[in-house]
């Protein structure tokens, strides 16, 4: 059975959209009108991983690009990056752990916890135009809640 995927955009709880910032970075900023076309479309793939109550393991690729969000240690700190992959082999059911996020969906709010680094979440800053990053705190200044908008294939 092939891996199932859906296309979507993500906005943080302050309604900031995610856009490309250079070849291997995402940033979050408020967009309006035609500028909304700049936001990245993700291909969210449902992969096998550790399951619990409200967690679904997913991989977040950029639609029609061979780039996936991944979590790696840089200078001993869990770090979010965009990683290039061989499009012939991805997505797949058995994604390497650095590509896997536990999607936690409660009341239409989503969090994305790194499977590689538990309690580290895809995060955005309160400030405009700042990089999307992996944050180790929830409920603080940084934003870890997102909403998902489905995009037709």
């Amino acid at each position: 059975a092939p891996v199932r995927s859906l296309n979507c955009t993500l906005r943080d709880s302050q309604q900031k959209s995610l856009v490309m910032s250079g070849p291997y970075e995402l940033k979050a900023l408020h967009l309006q009108g035609q500028d909304m076309e700049q936001q990245v479309v993700f291909s969210m793939s449902f992969v096998q991983g550790e399951e619990s109550n409200d967690k679904i393991p997913v991989a977040l690729g950029l639609k029609e690009k061979n780039l996936y969000l991944s979590c790696v240690l840089k200078d001993d700190k869990p770090t979010l990056q965009l990683e290039s992959v061989d499009p012939k082999n991805y997505p797949k059911k058995k994604m390497e752990k650095r590509f896997v996020f536990n999607k936690i969906e409660i009341n239409n709010k989503l969090e994305f916890e790194s499977a590689q680094f538990p309690n580290w979440y895809i995060s955005t800053s309160q400030a405009e135009n700042m990089p999307v990053f992996l944050g180790g705190t929830k409920g603080g200044q940084d934003i870890t809640d997102f909403t998902m908008q489905f995009v037709s294939s």
């Epitope: 059975a1 199932r4 969210m44 449902f46 399951e51 997913v58 059911k93």
Partner: antibody, heavy 118, light 106 residues
């Protein structure tokens, strides 16, 4: 925590339609990526997967039973319903529902035994 | 469909023994394979997925290996609570299960 519970008649007559209900808690079938499967096990025999319904109402059926099975969901009630038409004594089994976030089955109900007999 | 063949169908062993159960798929399933434990009157319990990944909470004496068509489940040192029936399941195609291996106390 995640719980699932199957309910349905204990006894059904041959040729009748069997309706089974899975009521679950601890997760929502409106959550993207979520699915619920039905699996059965005749007494003393192996497990057999029957059907699966995904959060987006995509449905999958066992090819050998597809013509007799219908799976549906009521997201607001946290229920999944399986109907099997034209039952036969060989359909006697314990019927389980299980949460399937696609591949293996991490959470199961306790099962409900259904006997098909005249 | 993909047939799963388990062997042996039954096995007698003692507490402390090392036990191996094998499962063969009728076609290549890569590592799309899970193992379950079932006790009488109970639902199956997921032990291993991806052929070798231990499900959370499962004791480390359980291990799985293999890829393609041949797989094994090993219990390194049998405990009294391990006597049960074990099933393999592939999910490369629509799910199918093996016929089970009943592990009994010698």
């Amino acid at each position: 925590q995640v719980t699932l519970k199957e309910s349905g008649p204990a006894l059904v007559k041959p040729t009748q339609t069997l309706t089974l209900t899975c009521t679950f808690s601890g997760f929502s079938l409106s959550t993207s990526g979520m699915g619920v499967s039905w699996i059965r096990q005749p007494p003393g025999k192996a497990l057999e997967w029957l059907a699966l319904i995904y959060w987006d109402d995509d449905k999958r059926y066992s090819p050998s039973l597809k013509s007799r099975l219908t799976i549906s969901k009521d997201t607001s009630k946290n229920q999944v319903v399986l109907t099997i038409t034209n039952v036969d004594p060989v359909d006697t089994a314990t019927y389980y529902c299980a949460r399937s976030a696609y591949y293996s089955f991490a959470y199961w109900g306790q099962g409900t035994l259904v006997s098909v007999s005249a | 469909d993909i047939q799963m063949t388990q062997s042996p169908s039954s096995l007698s062993a003692s507490v402390g023994d090392r036990v191996t159960i094998t499962c063969r798929a009728s076609q290549d399933v890569d590592t799309d394979l899970a193992w379950y434990q079932q006790k009488p009157g109970k639902a199956p319990k997921l032990l291993i997925y991806w052929a070798s990944t231990l499900q959370s909470g499962v004791p480390s004496r359980f291990s799985g290996s293999g890829s393609g068509t041949d797989f094994t489940l090993t219990i390194s040192s049998l405990q009294p609570e391990d006597f049960a029936t074990y099933y393999c399941q592939q999910y490369s195609s629509y799910p199918t299960f093996g016929a089970g291996t009943k592990l009994e106390l010698k």
